[in-house]
């Protein structure tokens, strides 16, 4: 197993609709054809898996149907979008990239993106 550099932004603010997007870029040392991308969340001394997708280079990123993540890939960049976020989901979101095929296996872990989520204030009742 070999190490690989992964870059991601330090901070992202989710939209008022609870959507956050960021780019995960990896320095591929070879010509990988099969790549696995996992988004992890670190909070309260625990790491949990948010979503994961395996894709063939040149093809679309496909997450499970019930996943809160969507994404697209372009070369060594993955554009990730996480939706349905609420204030309690604020935390450090880490991009983990694995080059699965062909060998050798490479593993890269980003430094994490701190995603801040602010729940929108409910609209006041209108007098009209």
């Amino acid at each position: 197993c070999k190490a690989m550099h992964v870059a991601q932004p330090a901070v992202v603010l989710a939209s008022s609709r609870g959507i956050a997007s960021f780019v995960c870029e990896y320095a591929s040392p070879g010509k990988a054809t099969e790549v696995r991308v996992t988004v992890l969340r670190q909070a309260d001394s625990q790491v949990t898996e948010v979503c994961a997708a395996t894709y063939m280079m040149g093809n679309e990123l496909t997450f499970l149907d019930d996943s809160i993540c969507t994404g697209t890939s372009s070369g060594n960049q993955v554009n990730l979008t996480i939706q349905g976020l609420r204030a309690m989901d604020t935390g450090l979101y880490i991009c983990k990239v694995e080059l699965m095929y062909p060998p050798p296996y490479y593993l890269g872990i980003g430094n994490g993106t701190q995603i801040y989520v602010i729940d929108p204030e409910p609209c006041p009742d209108s007098d009209f």
Epitope: A3, S45, Q46, G110, N111
Partner: nanobody, 126 residues
Framework: EVQLVESGGGLVQPGGSLRLSCAAS????????IGWFRQAPGKEREEVSC????????NYADSVKGRFTISRDNSKNTVILQMNSLRAEDTGVYYC???????????????????WGQGTQVTVSS
Amino acid sequence: EVQLVESGGGLVQPGGSLRLSCAASGGTLDYWSIGWFRQAPGKEREEVSCISGTGLRTNYADSVKGRFTISRDNSKNTVILQMNSLRAEDTGVYYCTGKLLHPSLWSACANEYDLWGQGTQVTVSS
């Protein structure tokens, strides 16, 4: 809150083997840096081995190199210390320790640990 629990200690003859296990209750050890320390009677506590959060890096004290092996079993949420060719000087209480580092340090062992188990006694004697 995560708690660490060691098991697998016991009495073994010189040259024998033991398999210590460090398990987490109340959470997981995923991506935690885990270390094993030991304290022999009348001696200071010393670090025996550690494994990084990714499992890519392992370190060993000179006194156990080639005899002890540390590994992660993420499916069982445990870290194993396999101890072979045990000697009388390996006798002591073995403690599992852990710390969740920043992701930038997941490939390294921790310099200090937040969490300590209660320890398990290992006695090597004929």
